[in-house]
Interface confidence: medium
């Protein structure tokens, strides 16, 4: 159905008050610099507009389309040219070019410093005042900080936000209350993040069909009662959806999730067994309890794979008539039998079997030559389930920060060019599988860690992209999605690589690291660590361990004593001169 | 759930032709791959001919080819046989059977369609 006013047709369907939340998070994804108060005030006078023109659809502007009307009002900012630079000339273009510009100029990592959050009560005084303000500073901060964060996500977040102050705010202790609460949100909304970053990076750099067989695969895995029909129909609903947000047209994406919603909650009996509870919710509750339900059980009665994907004997017919079709029901039908394989895992297995029927396809006798083809699987289920097995023996014997250690001397022996802020980034985060994964049961480890690992690792080569300094990072990020874990896990140590200068400064501490929390003090250790091996890249995991106990054993030492600073330019310089003789 | 219910079977002499007709009903039949299967007396149901679903990729039996059209049509939610130089080795009951939801594959193994007519008989005698 075509519409005369683009705006107005979001303004109906969303409602205002989702309206204004989204206008907002889009325009601070786009201008991340900009004051809060400003975008408050682009915000207000957009949703202005489109509620004039939902009352008159023929006024004057109401049918330009959201790009133009968006990118006009982007263009108003005075200070684009000063805050953007270049970002400015994008204005001189016309749509689609434009906003295309404007995407490019998305930044990654702004540097913005961590959110602090203030007194409880200095919070809850400012929630209580004014509630509407204070979400809307909530989504301009999360946003401008994550400029592809899946905006109709958000505002459910931004929703949980609010249920917590409207509770801890009447709490006897606020601190308590909103401490735990809001450290918990913190943790799904870096983890929503960098999920929705790994989609729209798929989608950007590897195409819609490497988007569509991710969703399959997971969908498959959720809902083994659909059939592929009833997958395939979600799975490209589901592919407009992220590409809209990806593409920051945050309104149509709301619309369209909302919409996906309802027809998932229309055909429930068709999909799944657990969408009942999801679908009495309110739309943001609805969509995000789908995005998140448990999966359905298997159906008791599933045939052997082999019967259509080896014995038939129209097996290079199906495969020659209609390669995606075909390729799309095998990995269905293999991801709905296989609930404790990554995703990741299922990909390559359909990548192995496109191969192989590429290859027999050609030949003479097609049945002989794909006849051993599911028994040529396992090596590749072997390899993921073997790495998982190892390294939560590690992370058991080690914990979270001696673990994160081991992968931070790893990475950077593998990469070490890459700036230290992403090396120790990016192995903190691949850390935390440990914490996320290894106390799962078997069934689900493997799911869990490498499926996480191919987001935390998108954050690597999204970072690396920004400023590309190792060649072997780039052909890991670029050459195939699906094989990027399985890339970085074989690189070995870069033998090219020359040590970097020694520079004292890098080494010098002071007595602000003893007030510093406890994951910030640790951030500092593993910078240290990171540098030392820059510095000194043939270091053995034993020289590196005494070093660190020592560095450990130093910061205590002067953070208990009397006068700290005096220790720490006093002992410093000690414990590098021991750590270079130490390292040689 | 989906029903199909065959007709246009009957006495027809060799060299003749004859249509038959599936209906389907619950479910759209262009999402499904769908196929005739026969079973002559005292023998083994045997796969005929079969269509993909979304994709209109055709399966026949080498006893068959050259001689039996599939084909449906979507509008009508129907699948049809169309049966040209009929011989009296073609004498037997026709079935219509379903698998939702797997375009492409229409396999000639009987027991992975779980959706069955109740089948139309169709005779080949001068």
């Known amino acids: 159905e075509a519409y005369k006013s683009e705006i107005a047709h979001r303004y109906n369907d969303l409602g205002e008050e989702h309206f204004r939340g989204l206008v907002l998070v889009a325009f601070s994804q786009y201008l991340q610099q900009c004051p809060f108060e400003d975008h408050v005030k682009l915000a207000k006078e957009v949703t202005e507009f489109a509620k004039a023109c939902a009352a008159e659809e023929s006024g004057a502007n109401c049918d330009k389309s959201l790009h133009t009307l968006f990118g006009d009002k982007l263009c108003t900012v005075a200070s684009l040219r000063d805050k953007y630079g270049d970002m400015a000339d994008c204005c001189e273009k016309q749509e689609p070019d434009r906003n295309e510009c404007f995407l490019a100029h998305k930044d990654d990592n702004p540097g913005f410093p961590p959110l602090v959050a203030p007194e409880p009560d200095a919070l809850c005084a400012a929630f209580q005042d004014n509630e509407q303000l204070f979400l809307g500073k909530y989504l301009y901060e999360i946003a401008r900080r994550h400029p592809y964060f899946y905006a109709p996500e958000l505002l459910y977040y931004a929703q949980q936000y609010k249920g917590v102050f409207a509770e801890c705010c009447q709490a006897a202790d606020k601190a308590a209350c909103l401490g735990p609460k809001i450290e918990a949100l913190r943790e799904k909304v870096l983890l929503s993040s960098a999920k929705e970053r790994f989609k729209c990076a798929s989608l950007q750099k590897f195409g819609d069909r490497a988007f569509k067989a991710w969703s399959v695969a997971r969908l498959s895995q959720r809902f083994p009662k659909a059939d592929f029909a009833e997958i395939s129909k979600v799975v490209t609903d589901l592919t407009k959806v992220h590409k809209e947000c990806c593409h920051g047209d945050l309104l149509e994406c709301a619309d369209d999730r909302a919409d996906l919603a309802k027809y998932m909650c229309e055909n429930q009996d068709s999909i799944s067994t657990k969408l009942k509870e999801c679908c009495d919710k309110p739309v943001l509750e609805k969509s995000q309890c789908l995005a998140e339900v448990e999966r359905d059980e298997l159906p008791g009665d599933l045939p052997s794979l082999a019967a259509d994907f080896v014995e038939d004997k129209e097996v290079c017919k199906n495969y020659q008539e209609a390669k995606d079709v075909f390729l799309g029901t095998f990995l269905y039908e293999y991801a709905r039998r296989h609930p404790e394989y990554s995703v990741s895992l299922l990909l390559r297995l359909a990548k192995e079997y496109e191969a192989t029927l590429e290859k027999c396809c050609a030949t003479d006798d097609p049945p002989t030559c794909y006849a051993k083809v599911l028994d040529e699987f396992k090596p590749l289920v072997d390899e993921p389930q073997n790495l998982v097995k190892t390294n939560c023996e590690l992370f058991e014997k080690l914990g979270e920060y001696g673990f994160q250690n081991a992968l931070l001397v790893r990475y950077t022996k593998k990469a070490p060019q890459v700036s230290t802020p992403t090396l120790v980034e990016v192995s903190r985060k691949l850390g935390k599988v440990g914490t996320k994964c290894c106390k799962k049961p078997e069934s689900e480890r493997m799911s869990c860690a490498e499926d996480f690992l191919s987001v935390v690792l998108n954050r690597l080569c999204v970072l690396h992209e920004k400023t590309p300094v190792s060649e072997r990072v780039t052909k890991c990020c670029s050459e195939s999605l699906v094989n990027r874990r399985p890339c970085f896990s074989g690189l070995e140590v870069d033998e090219t690589y020359v040590p970097k200068e020694f520079n004292a400064e890098t080494f010098t501490f002071h007595a602000d690291l003893c007030t510093l929390p406890e994951a910030e003090k640790q951030v500092k250790k593993q910078t240290a660590l990171v540098e030392l091996l820059k510095h000194k890249p043939k270091a053995t995991d034993e020289q590196l361990k005494t070093v660190m106990g020592d560095f450990g054993a130093f910061v205590e030492k002067c953070c208990a004593a009397e006068n700290k600073e005096g220790c720490f330019s006093e002992e410093g310089p000690k414990l590098v001169a021991a750590a270079q003789a130490a390292l040689v | 759930e989906v029903q199909l219910l065959e007709s246009g079977g009957g006495l027809v002499q060799p060299g003749g032709s004859l249509r038959l007709s599936c209906a389907a009903s619950?479910?759209?039949?262009?999402?499904?791959?769908v196929a005739w299967f026969r079973q002559a007396p005292g023998k083994e149901r045997e796969f005929v001919a079969g269509?993909?679903?979304?994709?209109?990729?055709?399966t026949y039996a080498d006893s068959v080819k050259g001689r039996f059209t599939i084909s449906r049509d979507n509008s009508k939610n129907t699948l049809y046989l169309q049966m040209n130089s009929l011989r009296p080795e073609d004498t037997a009951v026709y079935y219509c059977?379903?698998?939702?939801?797997?375009?492409?594959?229409?396999?000639?193994?009987?027991?992975?369609?779980?959706?069955w007519g109740q089948g139309t008989l169709v005779t080949v005698s001068s």
């Open positions: 619950g479910r759209y039949i262009d999402e499904t791959a």
């Open positions: 059977a379903a698998r939702p939801g797997r375009p492409l594959i229409t396999s000639k193994v009987a027991d992975l369609y779980p959706y």
């Open positions: 269509i993909g679903g979304g994709v209109d990729i055709t």
